[in-house]
């Protein structure tokens, strides 16, 4: 009988043999930032290193009653929830606990930042296998912390945090803000979001990935074998770091930004009953809850790619929203959405040597959002070919004209108010994939990439009579990088990828009084690389 | 995730006063900037991070510091430097009365000013 | 080898009180922990408490609390349970037995027959 | 409090039968269960340590099994000095140690 949540990220293979994944997570440490825990406790004693960092405020009141087990409680369930003998998710990892949360699991900024330095201070002097740094806390959004937190990210280190208990945006949040932390909420064992009294998980943009988070079995600190059930994102944050350890264990050379592909990509999809979040929250909320690889093979050979959406641009008329991809991936391609349907597109521009998605909003727009396709492509060279507007009634054109580059996304940006009142173009021409075409009174954007062995190809799905939504999705073993809506007209909401669906979304027609006559369709682009292909097939 | 323009509380305190002469002056146009939770229940005022420019040297932690300290007595302040960061970001952390920031701010080498808040288990 | 060989049972009359003795040789006194258990005539197992003799600390069973009391004599590698107030319903072979907390109880003395009776 | 209920109460077997007694915790315990026999007039011996290990000396016809909250204490093949009371134990914290009510195995 293994608890629902062990259950629940094990793939159908493993679950035969009880819960007995390979290895363990035993190349890997995970440091744990939280209250001091019970070293002893059979469920990690012998694998827990109790370091001797120690930086808490003062507890709370002037009858306060430091009582150990009370002080232990909440380190100690997580310390087994990652790593527990019987109730963890990474039985063989090991764990070197800090402790930066009082007895009423209280801390400060200050406290943690001096923690993770303590982290990297190790790290230089005994340089070890992969790190994991767990961070089963939250404060208010801040700066420096998250900082920080990208620093030693930086340095090779992966982070995981609890997206926070508020019932909130985890973007308001720290670190759940950071791009860099892999962000955790909770579902429960139906796959809903977990109510918290009368708050719960947070949700939005800055979430990564789902985990368990409610009703987790796990070691508690009033005795040496007892268990407890407990409740939270920082349980949810412990079955990724456990599920992180055991990736990392297999796959040692493993960076941030491989890893978090490779936690998307397994993660079950689509499962998580949105209703339970804010409507304005729900697109930006991914549903993803994390689950172990179904095996340990070298995954490598699948081009991943996520979605990253940029924080929501204001109302006034010239905001912009960018999204950025992370350190080690390659925007393939950009798109936009505005729920007013008012927005003058996007576009690839460079930053810093490095290129970010930019969405434009318009006039009387309420806000737009910028959506990143980021990927993961050794050897990938990409460059942005643009079209003005044409002006003609075919609309704009523009393709992907070097040797050896293939189309992988379109974007389209436009500086009149409303392309509605202008005359659409027909739908792109059959048998031309590296061609993208868009509204003639827009600048066409193509995103043209080289990588060995990279091929594409442009999937459509049009439907004559309007839709407030339109799907197109890659077929096993292509992937999407590319997601785009024709035409440009004004009743578009904008598109995005969601896994390796391409979404375009319009507005209700019957309520903007727009003839049936304007259909949509949704063009996805869908890659793969032979080249990592044959790479996996020489290493099978 | 967030941007660092993002939703927090920021108050930009662009000052080029130059009571403390020119050595205490930032470069030219530059302003340092301070921020602080926007939870109010969970500020911590009284210790603030001081956070230096990213290719600040590691020495020049310990002597903005000082610098600080210096300062501030003369002008009647007791300050207490907790903590000198070197491995993660250049900066310090210091506790002082809320009275010192406008003087803090104008610290060479200061790229923003935060002040501590509490985080909690989740 | 590991021996821990009871003493001190016998019949007492209702209201009475003894000390029963556990003597223990064969390993380091200080590592284990000795619980004390009693099983009455025909029935099963029963913890009253246990005294780990590193440190002198004890824990009772909340119905033996006012009842029961153990300590230790290190020099003599001995442990003690005093039982006062004693009713028929306290007859019952005692036993000592010593384990790591959260550990199995992995040696047991031979047990002490406790008789309460006028 | 964990309650750990036996079955069967009592069991009557012949020898070179097998026995098969279970335990189940109104708790998860992970595989923190210790199993006990005890013949009359002897003190409990540990038979099984953490769910399914067996303690030194213990012959290998006695096994265990099971983690979380169902066990089982298996004996493949009785023979006549396996007739006896067996218990099983776990850790709590109030009180710290809790024993099952037992089950007798007795000759047909």
């Known amino acids: 009988s293994i608890p629902w949540n062990l259950e629940r990220i094990t793939p159908a293979r493993y679950r035969a043999d009880e819960y007995q994944p390979p290895k363990g997570g035993s190349l890997v440490e995970v440091y744990l930032l939280d209250t001091s825990i019970q070293s002893d406790h059979r469920e990690i004693e012998g694998r827990v290193m109790v370091t001797d960092f120690e930086s808490v405020p003062e507890e709370d009141g002037t009858r306060f009653h430091r009582q150990a087990s009370k002080c232990d409680s909440h380190g100690t369930h997580l310390a087994g929830v990652v790593s527990g003998r019987d109730a963890g998710v990474a039985k063989g990892a090991g764990l070197r606990s800090l402790r930066v949360l009082n007895c009423q699991g209280k801390g400060t900024v200050s406290g943690t930042l001096i923690g993770l330095e303590f982290i990297r201070k190790s790290q230089l002097v005994q340089p070890v296998g992969p790190l994991v740094v767990l961070l089963p806390l939250a404060g208010g959004y801040s700066r420096v912390f998250n900082a920080a937190c990208q620093r030693l990210a930086r340095a090779g280190v992966v982070l995981v945090t609890a997206a926070g208990n508020f019932r909130d945006d985890a973007c308001l949040y720290s670190p759940a803000s950071a791009p860099e932390v892999i962000t955790v909420g909770a579902t429960n064992a139906q796959d809903q979001p977990v109510t918290l009294g009368t708050l719960g998980t947070n949700f939005g943009r800055c979430v990564d990935l789902f985990a368990p988070g409610e009703d987790i079995i796990g070691a508690s600190s009033d005795c040496s074998t007892c268990f407890v059930s407990r409740s939270g994102t920082s349980q949810a944050a412990a079955h990724v770091a456990g599920i992180a350890a055991m990736m990392l264990s297999a796959e040692p050379e493993l960076t941030l930004a491989e890893l978090r592909q490779r936690l998307i990509h397994f993660s079950a999809k689509d499962v998580i009953n949105e209703a339970w979040f804010p409507e304005d929250q729900r697109v930006l909320t991914p549903n993803l809850v994390a689950a172990l690889p179904p095996s340990t093979h070298r995954a490598g050979w699948q081009l991943f790619c996520r979605t990253v959406w940029s924080a929501h641009s204001g109302p006034t008329r010239m905001a912009t929203a960018v999204a950025r991809c992370a350190q080690d991936e390659e925007l393939l391609s950009c798109s936009s959405f505005s729920r007013s349907g008012k927005r003058r597109g996007e576009r690839i521009e460079a930053q810093g040597g490095k290129r970010v998605c930019r969405a434009h909003n318009a006039f009387g727009g309420e806000g737009v959002y910028a959506i990143a396709r980021c990927c993961l492509l050794p050897q990938v060279n990409c460059s942005v070919h643009t079209a003005p507007p044409a002006g003609a009634s075919m609309g704009t054109r523009v393709h992907c004209h070097q040797q050896g580059h293939v189309l992988t996304g379109c974007s389209s940006h436009w500086e009149v108010e409303d392309l509605g009142t202008h005359k659409p173009p027909v739908l792109r021409p059959r048998g031309q994939p590296n061609q993208c075409v868009g509204h003639r009174e827009a600048s066409i954007h193509a995103s043209c990439c080289h990588a060995p062995g990279l091929e594409c190809k442009v999937k459509e799905h049009g439907i004559p009579a309007p839709q407030e939504q339109v799907i197109v999705a890659c077929e096993d073993g292509w992937t999407l990088t590319g997601c785009s809506p024709l035409p440009g007209t004004s009743h578009v909401l904008g598109a995005y990828a969601v896994d390796n669906t391409c979404v375009v979304r319009s507005r209700d027609v019957s309520t903007t009084g727009s003839t049936s006559k304007e259909a949509v369709a949704a063009v996805a682009i869908c890659c793969r690389s032979r080249h990592l292909v044959q790479a996996s097939q020489e290493l099978q | 995730q967030e941007d660092e323009d993002g939703d927090y509380e920021e108050l930009v305190l662009a000052l080029r006063s130059e009571e403390d002469g020119l050595a205490d002056a930032p470069e030219h146009g530059a302003t340092a900037t301070f921020h602080r939770c926007a939870k109010d229940p969970w500020r911590l005022p009284g210790t603030y991070v001081v956070v230096l420019k990213e290719e600040t040297h590691r020495s020049q932690s310990e002597r903005t510091a000082r610098r600080l300290q210096a300062q501030a007595a003369r002008r009647g302040y007791l300050t207490k430097i907790l903590h000198v960061f070197h491995h993660l970001l250049p900066g310090f952390l210091v506790k002082m009365s809320g009275d010192l920031l406008e003087l803090a701010l104008k610290l060479p080498h200061v790229d923003y000013i935060e002040e501590d808040s509490s985080v909690f288990a989740q | 080898q590991v021996q821990l060989l009871e003493s001190g049972g016998g019949l007492v009359q209702p209201g009475g009180s003894l000390r029963l003795s556990c003597k223990a040789s064969?390993?380091?006194?200080?590592?284990?922990?000795i619980y004390w258990v009693r099983q009455a005539p025909g029935k099963g197992l029963e913890w009253i408490g246990w005294?780990?003799?590193?440190?002198?600390?004890?824990r009772y069973n909340q119905k033996f609390q006012s009842k029961a009391t153990i300590s230790r004599d290190n020099s003599k590698n001995t442990l003690y349970l005093q039982m006062n107030s004693l009713r028929a319903e306290d007859t019952a072979v005692y036993y000592c037995?010593?384990?790591?907390?959260?550990?199995?109880?992995?040696?047991w003395g031979q047990g002490t027959l406790v008789t309460v009776s006028s | 409090e964990i309650v750990l209920t036996q079955s069967p109460a009592t069991l009557s077997l012949s020898p070179g039968e097998r026995a098969t007694i279970t335990c189940r915790a109104s708790?998860?315990?992970?595989?923190?269960l210790n199993w006990y026999q005890q013949k009359p007039g002897q003190a409990p011996r540990l038979l099984i340590y953490?769910?399914?290990n067996r303690a030194t000396g213990i012959p290998a016809r006695f096994s265990g099994s099971g983690s979380g909250t169902d066990f089982t204490l298996t004996i493949s093949s009785l023979e006549p000095e396996d007739f006896a009371v067996y218990y099983c134990?776990?850790?709590?914290?109030?009180?710290?140690?809790?024993f099952g009510g037992g089950t007798k195995v007795e000759i047909k």
């Open positions: 037995a010593r384990a790591r907390v959260g550990y199995s109880l992995d040696y």
């Open positions: 064969g390993y380091t006194f200080s590592s284990y922990s």
């Open positions: 005294i780990d003799p590193g440190n002198g600390g004890t």
């Open positions: 708790q998860y315990v992970g595989s923190y």
């Open positions: 953490d769910a399914s």
């Open positions: 134990q776990v850790w709590d914290s109030s009180p710290p140690v809790v």
